[in-house]
């Protein structure tokens, strides 16, 4: 077996127990079979190798671990627990590894874990205690600062009989363990709504990505507590209008940049306040690109170019005159 490379380039390890000539356990800092390791970069890459389990003999020096493009299916409790622990592991990327089940305590015993990417896994079963590690009402704080959960929605036929949004939010809020989270990415998850309590309990957020979902309204969502929020991505949703309460909250955030492109804005009388706000605010990035989708007569009109005379509502007919 070849020892781990100490150069900054990656060294592919030979399968270190393949020959069985030596029946000794592998050295603690040896590179696992099917992985590439750089001790200088403190990085291990086990990428696109169809692994069905997390390698057991990860080198203790690992700071950045890439396990992308595998077939892990399930992360059990203590999936990364080792003796001695992986005390340096700070960034863990598990994207695209066919995970559909992440159990309670899957990331326990990783005291330095700051970045976790579970994107592009069909997470039909994400335990409420996946990130908190215990079912206590208040857990030990997680060290996580960045949590990337883009495109984790399973196919329709694999979803359980429960709200996918609710399952994800339960994992985010359990035990208040993620109070230190600064970046949360939830893009491309078919979210229809954002549970109202989720943002209030993540007070440290700087970056929130909810792009490419199916959010229709933000009426019940409060951004008031997110005083550190710097970017809010709401592109490619199903937003029709932002109401006064939301506009005021966004305007009150001192560092915020909001991204609203590619939403089907309804340019009727309910849009007047938002148009007025858009003309005055500096928080919306690319606001000159926002266009109406409805009604038909307003399609492709630029929101910033509208005036109050353009924004009318059809009179509501009495029930006796409405057609079915």
């Amino acid at each position: 077996s070849s020892p781990t490379s100490s150069a900054s380039s990656f060294s592919s390890s030979a399968p270190f127990l393949a020959s069985a000539v030596s029946a000794q356990p592998p050295l603690p800092d040896q590179c696992p079979a099917l992985c590439e390791c750089s001790e200088a970069a403190r990085t291990v890459k086990c990428v696109n190798r169809n692994l069905t389990e997390v390698p057991t003999d990860l080198p203790a020096y690992v700071r950045n671990l890439f396990l992308t493009g595998n077939q892990l299916a399930v992360l059990p409790a203590g999936a990364f627990a080792r003796r001695p622990p992986l005390a340096e592991l700070a960034a863990l990327n598990l994207s695209g590894s066919r995970l559909d089940e992440v159990r309670a305590g899957a990331f326990e015993h990783l005291p330095s874990l700051r970045q976790l990417d579970l994107s592009h896994n069909p997470l039909a079963d994400l335990s409420p205690f996946a990130f908190s590690g215990s079912n206590a009402s208040v857990s030990a704080p997680s060290p996580l600062v960045e949590l990337i959960l883009n495109h984790i929605v399973p196919p329709e036929d694999e979803r359980q009989n429960r709200s996918f949004e609710g399952m994800v939010v339960a994992a985010l809020l359990a035990g208040r363990a993620l109070q230190g989270l600064r970046r949360l990415e939830l893009a491309s998850n078919h979210f229809l709504y954002l549970p109202r309590d989720v943002l209030a309990q993540l007070p440290s957020l700087r970056h929130l990505d909810l792009s490419n979902n199916s959010l229709v309204s933000l009426t019940y969502v409060s951004f008031r507590n997110l005083t550190h929020l710097e970017s809010l991505h709401l592109e490619d949703n199903a937003l029709k209008v932002l109401h006064n309460g939301t506009l005021a909250e966004l305007q009150g955030l001192p560092h915020i940049r909001v991204f609203l492109d590619n939403n089907p804005w309804v340019c009727d009388c309910h849009m007047a306040d938002m148009v007025t706000w858009l003309k005055e605010t500096e928080v919306v990035q690319g606001k000159d690109r926002l266009t109406c989708a409805y009604p038909e007569k307003m399609r492709n009109r630029v929101l910033l170019e509208l005036n109050s005379a353009d924004l009318d509502c059809d009179p509501i007919l009495p029930p006796s005159l409405q057609t079915s």
Partner: antibody, heavy 120, light 111 residues
Framework: EVQLVESGGGLVQPGGSLRLSCAAS????????MHWVRQAPGKGLEWVSY????????YYADTVKGRFTISRDNAKNSLYLQMNSLRDEDTAVYYC?????????????WGQGTTVTVSS | DIVLTQSPDSLAVSLGERATINCRAS??????????LHWYQQKPGQPPKLLIK???NLESGVPDRFSGSGSGTDFTLTISSLQAEDVAVYYC?????????FGQGTKLEIK
């Protein structure tokens, strides 16, 4: 046809060593995780050890941890179990078995077994 | 460790009659994605043979008189119409976590 053939069993004194082998044929060996399972005379089945398809993961029962080492050679379609510091209670028929993964898998093919007897 | 307890320890059933074997786990071995419980048959002098995977999925080539059911902690193996060749010891096994464990076995005989 999937075939697993164990060898290397025999009589050994307590404290001694043995190396079991399992020769695989009839399937793509390098695509499958492999287990050792044992059965003491007149007793039930006991899982011993697992190795993943590419030798990245190794697991052992507490009863053998530190004494047994599992390994494989995909080029030779072979699985091994190095058994050191053998005890009377290691006496059993040892089976090798195939699986598609550790937790989401099951023992879907078995060898006929090789008998290990530890006795003074 | 998860303990699997089979009942009964032994069972005598007439040919053509139904045989039922139970397996109880000391904790749940099911998630909403998968059930980590499997059944095996071992005839005298032979290695075990997989019958049922993930609680209820019949292994290819196994006669359809065998069926499995259950989730969580309680599971059942049923032979709808006992045949002479079904005399064997039957084991349940979980793959929820390490260590993998088996039930103690149920010996099935002809009455």
């Amino acid at each position: 046809e999937v075939q697993l053939v164990e060898s290397g069993g025999g009589l050994v004194q307590p404290g001694g060593s043995l190396r079991l082998s399992c020769a695989a044929s009839g399937f793509t060996f390098s695509n499958f995780g492999m287990h050792w399972v044992r059965q003491a005379p007149g007793k039930g089945l006991e899982w011993v050890s697992y190795i993943s398809s590419g030798s990245t993961s190794f697991y052992y029962a507490d009863t053998v941890k530190g004494r047994f080492t599992i390994s494989r050679d995909n080029a030779k379609n072979s699985l091994y179990l190095q058994m050191n510091s053998l005890r009377d209670e290691d006496t059993a028929v040892y089976y090798c078995s195939r699986t598609n993964s550790l937790l989401r898998g099951f023992f879907d093919a078995w060898g006929q077994g090789t008998t290990v007897t530890v006795s003074s | 460790d998860i303990v699997l307890t089979q009942s009964p320890d032994s069972l005598a059933v007439s040919l053509g009659e139904r045989a039922t074997i139970n397996c109880r786990a000391s904790q749940s071995v099911s998630s909403s994605s998968y059930t980590y419980l499997h059944w095996y048959q071992q005839k005298p002098g032979q290695p075990p043979k997989l019958l049922i995977k993930s609680a209820s999925n019949l292994e290819s080539g196994v006669p359809d008189r065998f069926s499995g059911s259950g989730s969580g902690t309680d599971f059942t193996l049923t032979i709808s119409s006992l045949q002479a060749e079904d005399v064997a010891v039957y084991y349940c096994q979980h793959s929820w976590e390490i260590p993998l464990t088996f039930g103690q076995g149920t010996k099935l005989e002809i009455k």
